[in-house]
């Protein structure tokens, strides 16, 4: 029978090395065997390149195309082929369809004044246009209470978020994940980062540690502060361990 495209290709670029196009066929298709997506930069001397699509679902195909470091003027001509039959033809401008890379290495650290410091890495090298354009959304959720979740918008430059432990339930396990977008490029959101999980043991700090904590932490040097956090982490670890085994 004839091969038809049900939903034409939708493409996004990470604006550094890769563009991804996805489309849906009108029936289950072996994408890599039956289809090819050709792409060519609209630039003098540019060669034609071919992308072999993979199946995302029975009838959904996805093609990941290596591109050079994108610039605003870049426009690609795309042609979807089934053998000698041209199924679809269109153009794609990466700068107008940006989906940032996923932020990486999300970690949670205890910080001064009963706060948690969430840190992650900017997925772009400093020389890339997007490095300084990203803002982030951090989602913090209680692993045991679906209604206990918070969303934080990080619109300043640094990939960090300070979170007061008192805003979270004491003794609860929390997970955080982060995603990025680039406002000036009117991008879509990136995929969420993998989650990182930690135990929030906030109240009462004094009883739990068995000694008072100066507040504010006046006269306490960083070594003393580290000792407190190490002790706190050990207690948390033991509690968590105990919790999981009994």
């Amino acid at each position: 029978g004839s091969v038809k495209v049900l939903h034409e290709p939708s493409c996004f670029s990470d604006y550094i090395s890769t563009s991804v196009c996805q489309w849906k066929m009108d029936h289950p298709t072996n994408c890599s065997a039956e289809l090819r997506l050709s792409y060519q930069l609209d630039f003098m001397g540019s060669e034609n390149h071919t992308c072999v699509p993979e199946n995302r679902e029975d009838s959904v195909c996805v093609c990941s195309m290596p591109i050079d470091d994108a610039v605003e003027a870049d426009v690609y001509q795309l042609d979807l082929w089934a053998g000698q039959q041209l199924l679809w033809s269109g153009s794609f401008q990466p700068s107008k369809h940006v989906k940032p890379r996923t932020p990486g290495n999300l970690t949670v650290h205890p910080n001064i004044s009963h706060t948690w410091l969430l840190m992650w890495t900017n997925p772009y090298p400093t020389e890339n246009h997007l490095h300084s354009e990203l803002t982030y959304m951090v989602n913090v959720s209680n692993d045991n209470d679906p209604e206990d979740f918070k969303v934080y918008n990080v619109t300043y430059m640094g990939p960090t978020l300070r979170l007061a432990a008192s805003t979270l339930k004491s003794g609860a396990s929390y997970s955080a994940r982060v995603r990025a977008w680039a406002q000036t490029y009117n991008s879509t959101w990136s995929d969420w980062s993998p989650s990182t999980t930690w135990l929030n043991y906030y109240e009462p700090w004094e009883q739990h540690l068995g000694k008072p904590i100066p507040n504010p932490l006046l006269g306490l040097d960083s070594t003393g502060l580290n000792d407190i956090f190490e002790a706190q982490k050990i207690e948390w670890h033991e509690h968590h361990h105990h919790h999981h085994h009994h």
Epitope: M44, G45, S46, N48, H49, D68, V71
Partner: antibody, heavy 125, light 112 residues
Framework: EVQLVESGGDLVKPGGSLRLSCVAS????????MTWVRQAPGKGLQWVSL????????YYADAVKGRFTISRDNAKNTLYLQMNSLRAEDTAVYYC??????????????????WGQGTLVTVSS | DIVMTQTPLSLSVSPGETASISCRSS???????????LDWYLQKPGQSPQGLIY???KRASGVPDRFSGSGSGTDFTLRISRVEANDTGVYYC?????????FGQGTKLEIK
Amino acid sequence: EVQLVESGGDLVKPGGSLRLSCVASGFTFRDYAMTWVRQAPGKGLQWVSLISGSGGKTYYADAVKGRFTISRDNAKNTLYLQMNSLRAEDTAVYYCAVDRLTKTIRPQYYGLWVWGQGTLVTVSS
Amino acid sequence: DIVMTQTPLSLSVSPGETASISCRSSQSLLYSIGYNYLDWYLQKPGQSPQGLIYLGSKRASGVPDRFSGSGSGTDFTLRISRVEANDTGVYYCMQGLQSPNTFGQGTKLEIK
């Protein structure tokens, strides 16, 4: 050493045909676009045609479109210009030159960084 | 087609002086930041042309730093400082952005 050597220039009558060759050495020929430029006696330079590294893309000046055909044989490191329906105004020295690197998605541009010595084409009755 | 216009068409300069040649394009040659597809070539008497400057300001291999290119968009300049007798010839600008690539009319540099 990067080198280009043209040949095939000759005296030909109007309406006649001629094929120019340009043999390249000293660089990875298939990775680069190649260009033909001509210069009529006592005149300036005129861009004629470009072909991408694989030979898949070709471009022509309006003055030669439909009459000239650029091609290449990457196995022989040779560039060609097939010239048909020649006119008196095609009389010129024809130079081949190495153009942009086209094996990358966006060609890397260095200008016309090496030129041949040229071959003279004279169209006259 | 993009039209390239050079000025002046001829120039006479004494050795040691600076020569400046202007090239103007009918459309912008700026593709992206820092990438102006404008070249400068020199054709010495009886020789093939040779590349001097590409992408507006980058010197070709082996070209002395006396030769410098500047400009962006539609207005470009080639400067030759401390001119030598060996710099005699015809200088051409060329746009490499759009097909057909096009040359300026050429500027003849004469050393006094």
